[in-house]
């Protein structure tokens, strides 16, 4: 299957290059226009003559100038200027501003709280399964299995710190070696990036906003995936992370430090602990093959307990089974030994909603999952609305310039590195990369931050979360100190290595180009965003997990042909765009493949049919639901009953888009289908209205 949604009809003919007019591109001088048929399966479409650039990107000329979809939107200030207001108006405006700020902070607070509860919900739904992933003995010998377990567990518990702490406790108790733990940590790094991708899905109502938000969120995903793609084989071959971190750990004589500062948790915990409290040790116990833990509930019931250590006498089949030879006897009938037991006395119950319900973990998890997603979505809509009303005119200009402008020459290159430090610092303050990147996502969506600036902030966030882990490691008890510190350092150096790979040289900033490509695809086919999420965070890891369980022969047998095909497609793609003349005529484009293998259009039709049942009746209740509906059906008609989304398709129908010359695209490999839409007509819909 072709690597991009639609691999155009670029025909490598030096005299004439024809391409189906699919969508808007940056402006360019006029070129001649002609009509033709591209595919026997499609109706006549506009054909355009291309310049001899051998580009597979659509080249469209437009009579009116249309902005690049990646340009930040201008947030118009429709209000009265400050200077034109009277005293009463100024006071009113001031208090409105204060009110908006309080509302913004309030919604931001509940947004962060809902992320915390979302994590708890995921742990309740999939925590025990996550724990069982860890108890797989093949992790030791199979780094790929370790990687996917790291991804799956972190996705299931929605917290890299939880999965990392499980790994630490397993290493401390010699159930896992540091070598085997490193791929799991890499996987946890990938898994943690799902949170802001989910947050980006909440901005699905507005195409241009969604394009930016989704790209801004997935830049984190691509950075992590690409880093693993390069660094996992390097680690397996050289064990450089293990060696460097071992040298550091051995060269310092660390003393147990203070606990890592809980900065944001101090504010959010009083609220979240009223909703639900979890006993995180249960997941760790399951990971360590504790049979009793499998029947324990993750919902914490008793918050105040008294632990008393005592010795009890237990019977043993024979005196050979005694725990201690000196503490063994018979009463003439049974053989006895003494056993040290910890007796736990429950004193006070926890104060949270679910303490007296005695519901199964799955039920509590499902309830919390739905509620937290609704609150998350609601808060996000409100944050976007308030920011939209605040960030207008001069305010927007100042903020955008401050955030997105580089230092003056010759220090422009330093700006990105400062952004990395800011990202690391902010993540250290909020104690969670998920919270920081999730807060960043709507800002990228509404156009306050560019993806180019969000990228180093996200990389910094990756560093920030590891510094938190290092501090937590230094605070861990003696027996766990070495292993937890080494793992935290592995995590740190893995992210540093990733930054060195994909940041310093602008050419290597592949994650930005890939994220923009995905943003374009997802803006046109919004269902593809969900498809991407399921494929990359669930199906691929689960497939690798399943194949690994079947044995390395099966994994290699299936994996090698798949990897070979991917490499072949990528090489072919590169040759098609760079030097198609070296290829046989048939391979100079993707037309030799059936349409369903090179385009998302047929798939879109299938998805539309599948979700057709939702289209008239799914979302008449609330606008939050509407977003989910728009995402599923990718059809604005479905929300007409709630006046949530406008019918954009009708507005776009019948538009003839003239030819234009190739302009500077971020990614020459992005298909024309992915770029094929006019954001101008879809810039602001009622989807964000309340």
């Amino acid at each position: 299957m072709a690597p991009w949604p639609e691999l155009g009809d670029a025909q490598p003919n030096p005299d004439k290059y024809l391409e189906g007019a699919a969508g808007q591109q940056p402006t360019a001088p006029d070129k001649s226009k002609e009509t033709n048929k591209t595919d026997n399966t499609e109706a006549p479409v506009t054909k355009i003559e291309l310049l001899p650039s051998y580009s597979t990107a659509t080249l469209i000329d437009e009579p009116t100038e249309v902005d690049d979809p990646w340009n930040l939107p201008t947030l118009q200030d429709s209000g009265i200027k400050w200077s034109e207001r009277d005293t009463k108006g100024k006071i009113l405006c001031f208090f409105q501003g204060i009110g908006r700020l309080i509302l913004l902070l309030g919604f931001l607070y509940f947004f962060v709280c809902s992320l915390d509860i979302l994590s708890s919900a995921f742990q309740l739904v999939g925590g025990k399964m996550a724990g069982q992933f860890f108890s797989n003995s093949s992790i030791m010998s199979n780094p790929l299995l370790g990687l996917v377990i790291g991804v799956l567990v972190t996705v299931l518990v929605q917290s890299s710190s939880t999965s990392t702490s499980i790994v630490v406790s397993m290493v401390s108790s010699s159930l896992l070696t540091v070598r085997a733990a490193i791929p799991i940590i890499m996987g946890a790094n990938i898994g943690t990036s799902i949170t802001n991708t989910i947050v980006a899905l909440m901005q699905v109502g507005d195409r241009s906003e969604f394009r930016r938000a989704f790209a801004g969120a997935t830049v984190h995903d691509f950075f992590n995936w690409l880093s693993v793609l390069v660094l996992l084989p390097v680690e397996v071959a050289t064990h450089y992370l293990e060696i460097i971190t071992q040298l550091i750990v051995e060269s310092f004589h660390f003393k147990n430090g203070e606990d890592a500062p809980d900065l944001l948790k101090v504010i959010t915990k009083p609220f979240t602990k009223l909703i639900v409290q979890l006993d995180k040790k249960v997941i760790s116990q399951i990971a360590m093959n504790d049979e009793k833990a499998k029947n324990k509930s993750l919902v914490k019931i008793w918050c105040k307990t008294f632990t008393n250590k005592t010795q009890i006498n237990v019977t043993v089949p024979s005196t050979a089974n005694c725990t201690s030879p000196s503490l063994c006897w018979t009463d003439g009938i049974q053989n006895w030994t003494m056993k040290n037991v910890t007796y736990k006395e429950n004193i006070a119950k926890c104060q949270h909603i679910f303490v007296n319900f005695h519901l199964p973990d799955l039920a509590v998890g499902t309830i919390l999952l739905i509620l937290s997603l609704l609150v998350l979505c609601g808060c996000l809509i409100m944050i976007v609305k308030i920011l939209g009303s605040v960030l207008k005119g001069q305010v927007a200009t100042v903020i955008k310039k401050t955030i997105n402008t580089d230092f003056p020459f010759p220090f422009a290159w330093l700006t990105g590195y400062l952004a990395i430090l800011v990202g690391a610092g902010m993540t250290f303050i909020v104690q969670s990369s998920s919270v920081f990147t999730s807060a960043l996502t709507p800002l990228i969506g509404i156009g306050v931050i560019t993806i180019e600036r969000a990228y180093p902030l996200t990389l910094g966030s990756n560093i920030g979360t590891t510094t938190t882990a290092i501090l937590a490691a230094l605070a861990s008890p003696g027996n766990a100190l070495r292993s937890s510190l080494q793992i935290a350092l592995c995590h740190f150096f893995f992210n540093i290595s990733g930054i060195l790979l994909w940041y310093p040289i602008p050419f290597t900033r592949l994650p930005i180009r890939m994220a923009k490509g995905l943003g374009n695809i997802s803006a046109k086919y919004r269902w593809f965003a969900v498809f991407y999420l399921i494929i990359f965070f669930f199906l691929i890891p689960l497939t690798v997990f399943g194949l690994s369980l079947a044995g390395w022969r099966v994994l290699v047998g299936v994996g090698v042909p798949v990897v070979f095909i991917i490499i072949l497609v990528l090489c072919l793609r590169l040759l098609q765009s760079r030097c198609p003349r070296v290829l046989p005529k048939k391979l100079q484009n993707w037309n030799f493949l059936p349409l369903w293998m090179r385009s998302l259009k047929p798939w879109d039709a299938v998805v539309s049919k599948f979700t057709g049942c939702f289209q008239m009746r799914c979302c008449c209740c609330c606008r939050v639901c509407c977003r989910a509906c728009c995402l599923l059906c990718d059809c604005p008609k479905c929300c007409r009953c709630s006046k949530c989304c406008e019918d954009l398709e009708e507005a776009q129908e019948g538009q003839d888009v003239p030819v234009k010359a190739p302009e500077t695209f971020d990614n020459i490999t992005i298909s024309r289908e992915a770029q094929g839409e006019v954001p101008a007509s879809d810039s602001k819909t009622e989807c964000t209205a309340l």
Partner: antibody, heavy 120, light 107 residues
Framework: QVQLVQSGAEVKKPGSSVKVSCKTS????????IHWVRQAPGQGLEWIGG????????NYKQNFRGRVTLTADKSTSTAYMELSSLRSEDTAVYYC?????????????WGQGTTVTVSS | DIVVTQSPSSLSTSVGDRVTITCTAS??????VAWYQQKPGKSPKLLIY???TRHTGVPERFTGSGSGTDFTLTISSVQPEDVATYFC?????????FGVGTKLELK
């Protein structure tokens, strides 16, 4: 106070059986094990076996198996030892003793003993 | 079965003397050893259990020690009422076995 009162002396013919009782008081009968120990004239102590009255689980010394039967009546807090196929060498004083179940305190209280004489 | 050997089989002592009775097990019994006192014509009485723990009401002059295979019962200052036969017993493994006894007499 703790008491283990045994039945009176018995004179038996070889090949016959004897049943000795041990009535207890002053403690929870079911929380203890009742052991039977014998002492031949001028000899040391020899363990016969024991019973847990709570669940009637018994254990006997190998050379008494098949000849001895230990029983307990919870309602009267009484333990019984029946020895069959009596031989002259079974002439001894038979003691019952209690042992706290699941505890390592050994036989902390004994009965006064029952003399069994086997002669033709 | 574990064989318990007691020595001496009898000993004669004076009031106020310090007396030591030894007991050796044929294999390691940890600390699962008890000492009993049997006065003439009476039933045995528990003195020491778990090798060194005095039973309730036993005078402090009686001390037990040892672990593994070698054990001792010490009477720090013999009193006239201590005239009796002393038995040691192992309860490490079934069957429970007793020593032959040590007869303590006053000179």
């Amino acid at each position: 106070q703790v008491q283990l009162v045994q039945s009176g002396a018995e004179v038996k013919k070889p090949g016959s059986s004897v049943k000795v009782s041990c009535k207890t008081s002053g403690f929870f009968f079911t929380e203890y094990i009742i052991h039977w120990v014998r002492q031949a004239p001028g000899q040391g102590l020899e363990w016969i076996g024991g019973i847990i009255p709570n669940n009637d689980v018994t254990n006997y010394k190998q050379n008494f198996r098949g000849r001895v039967t230990l029983t307990a009546d919870k309602s009267t807090s009484t333990a019984y030892m029946e020895l069959s196929s009596l031989r002259s060498e079974d002439t001894a004083v038979y003691y019952c003793a209690r042992w706290r179940n699941a505890y390592y305190s050994a036989m902390d209280s004994w009965g006064q003993g029952t003399t069994v004489t086997v002669s033709s | 079965d574990i064989v318990v050997t007691q020595s001496p089989s009898s000993l004669s002592t004076s009031v106020g003397d310090r007396v030591t009775i030894t007991c050796t097990a044929s294999q390691d019994v940890g600390t699962a050893v008890a000492w009993y006192q049997q006065k003439p014509g009476k039933s045995p009485k528990l003195l020491i259990y778990w090798a060194s723990t005095r039973h309730t009401g036993v005078p402090e002059r009686f001390t037990g020690s040892g672990s593994g295979t070698d054990f001792t019962l010490t009477i720090s200052s013999v009193q006239p009422e201590d005239v009796a036969t002393y038995f040691c017993q192992q309860y490490r493994t079934s069957p429970l076995t007793f020593g032959v006894g040590t007869k303590l007499e006053l000179k």
